[in-house]
Interface confidence: low
Amino acid sequence: WELTILHTNDVHSRLEQTSEDSSKCVNASRCMGGVARLFTKVQQIRRAEPNVLLLDAGDQYQGTIWFTVYKGAEVAHFMNALRYDAMALGNHEFDNGVEGLIEPLLKEAKFPILSANIKAKGPLASQISGLYLPYKVLPVGDEVVGIVGYTSKETPFLSNPGTNLVFEDEITALQPEVDKLKTLNVNKIIALGHSGFEMDKLIAQKVRGVDVVVGGHSNTFLYTGNPPSKEVPAGKYPFIVTSDDGRKVPVVQAYAFGKYLGYLKIEFDERGNVISSHGNPILLNSSIPEDPSIKADINKWRIKLDNYSTQELGKTIVYLDGSSQSCRFRECNMGNLICDAMINNNLRHTDEMFWNHVSMCILNGGGIRSPIDERNNGTITWENLAAVLPFGGTFDLVQLKGSTLKKAFEHSVHRYGQSTGEFLQVGGIHVVYDLSRKPGDRVVKLDVLCTKCRVPSYDPLKMDEVYKVILPNFLANGGDGFQMIKDELLRHDSGDQDINVVSTYISKMKVIYPAVEGRIKHHHHHH
């Protein structure tokens, strides 16, 4: 018996087609993805093959103005239109709190939404009961397939799920649900979830009875053969894990942003064992036409967005590099722009002794979610900025000791090279790292811009001095592992909305041209 699994993950509000780097579509003939194009391909496969499941592994929420304006109603509407069979909850589904998940999505979705390792407690338990499920048994042709969901245990650190949801260890929570499916004589089981590729592989290895793992969260691109676009494969598709009980378990992910449709064919024997698996992500490029009815619906929903966001704020005459390949590894000019805007937003010349009360900014590279291409007449709109800063956070003012800042910069590179979000972009700070040194001891120089001076200049950080710093509320709250900031901050004042800070700065400057200028340096010392 053969099953076709079509899957998406980390779509992040890319309902419309995008450019190749998943930012706003500029040249339609070269654009990719979007739900209208996705629907065309899904329907084509549904017509051609008998047993097809369309699954999403979480993080539909958050990423463009679509989510800013529609707050999840767009996800329910268009996933219903595409007739998704199931979805796992991702961490970003909690970005607007539990209410922001229940009302627009859980109550409106016509497909099961799954997570076995999220347990509700207190008053929320009855309110959310039945709105999401640990697993669902789906009829497919003459057979049944069990889908069991999971969500990153880190969600409380990554989003806003509140205090009435407990996120359990994925493996511990999944095993009893899979065992239950086995007692129901369901012998073909897919784990669908959002915890990242490493956890996907661990689930494949450790959870007895899971036949296939369909994952998300780490935006992992897997491919067998020559990849069709810019993404470099992290491994073959499917990635085969040998489970502890000796089975070969295919693990798949489909990158992110709706650029690819995962396509996996699985052959099962009569006892539900996987005999073979093969496939590849399908690049949803412009050779696949957008479905006219879905496209018309998109255009109808689009009107509200146009009014909201298409006015030009200012112009850039340089490429604003907000790619994860840059901002999570080195100084990027998008990070410099945002930090400069954050400082500019906090100019308060109230004392002759100080040119300003604050001179320093830090910004987690993982919070920069998109580049902006200057080749669109240089125009920057609210919509462009909403793709760069999609999380609706604030830029806050904190007071920290120098020793806390030193810890933060060590944390910035403690696992450098894995494209993790904690790599810090800066303003008013010059930092030098030596990555050949052991984690926790990689900051070899840390100079900060003086405030109590008429001519600003850089001085070495003093461990016992108290400094003011502008940073995202996400970092002030200990996000991305910056627990030392949360634990050790001496004062925290909430600031303005992140997009508004940057848009105001761009409007003020009119034309911008941020550079990479040596704020962050990597010094390679060889033993």
């Epitope: 245990k153 650190f157 490493e198 661990l202 810890k407 944390h411 403690h414 696992r415 052991k438 984690p439 926790g440 592992g481 627990q483 030392m484 634990d487």
Partner: antibody, heavy 117, light 107 residues
């Protein structure tokens, strides 16, 4: 300078619970890193028991999971190991160490626990 | 669990010798490998992390290489204080596991 020091009884009777404490100086266990217990039976190799994280999550070696509990007392900057239903096979030098998803850079000097009636 | 297999389990060598110890992982652990030195009655000491990076204060005669599943610790010129037991350990995923150890003895 980060220092770790194990303490606890050196002799435990079979079927009882082994209890050890690791006192950390020079670094707050709530700041970062994972705080581990590792053991080494006499003349044998090293076995990772489990850890408690800076944000109070646990991870245990599946081979010991049903018997082990690692907890912490942040006011004393200590973390503790409890291993229940011990047998002679649990006789070992027990080390506490900082690390986990990073290598084990700092270790205690180790404490020998003998299981015997 | 990922098994770490070290070889040889013991070796005899003289001061000045070049010594090589190998460690094989049962699955791909990328570069998430550390080497430790342990002397009798003492705690292990970190020598190498991330397969090839030298720990702080570790003499440059120690070096590490490899990635994926096969790793090597090399002592370019054995010194009297190097006679000890050496362990490899992966920190790719839990449970973290150690190799069985290699005892380096005086010939």
């Amino acid at each position: 300078q980060v220092q770790l020091q194990e303490s606890g009884p050196g002799l435990v009777k079979p079927s009882e619970t082994l209890s050890l404490t690791c006192t950390v100086s020079g670094y707050s266990i709530t700041s970062r890193y994972y705080w581990n217990w590792i053991r080494q039976p006499p003349g044998k190799g090293l076995e990772w028991i489990g850890y408690i994280t800076y944000d109070d999550n646990n991870n245990y070696n599946p081979s010991l999971k049903n018997r082990v509990t690692i907890s912490r007392d942040t006011s004393k900057n200590q973390f503790s190991l409890k291993l229940s239903s011990v047998t002679a096979a649990d006789t070992a030098v027990y080390y506490c160490a900082r690390g986990g998803w990073d290598p084990f850079l700092y270790w205690g000097q180790g404490t020998l626990v003998t299981v015997s009636s | 669990d990922i098994q770490m297999t070290q070889s040889p389990s013991s070796l005899s060598a003289s001061v000045g010798d070049r010594v090589t110890i190998t460690c094989r992982a049962s699955d791909n652990i990328y570069s998430y490998l550390a080497w430790y030195q342990q002397k009798p009655g003492k705690a292990p000491k970190l020598l190498i992390y991330s397969a090839k990076n030298l720990g702080e204060g570790v003499p440059s005669r120690f070096s590490g290489s490899g990635s994926g599943t096969d790793f090597t610790l090399t002592i370019s010129s054995l010194q009297p204080e190097d006679f000890a037991t050496y362990y490899c350990q992966h920190y790719y995923g839990t449970p973290f596991t150690f190799g069985g150890g290699t005892k380096v003895e005086i010939k």
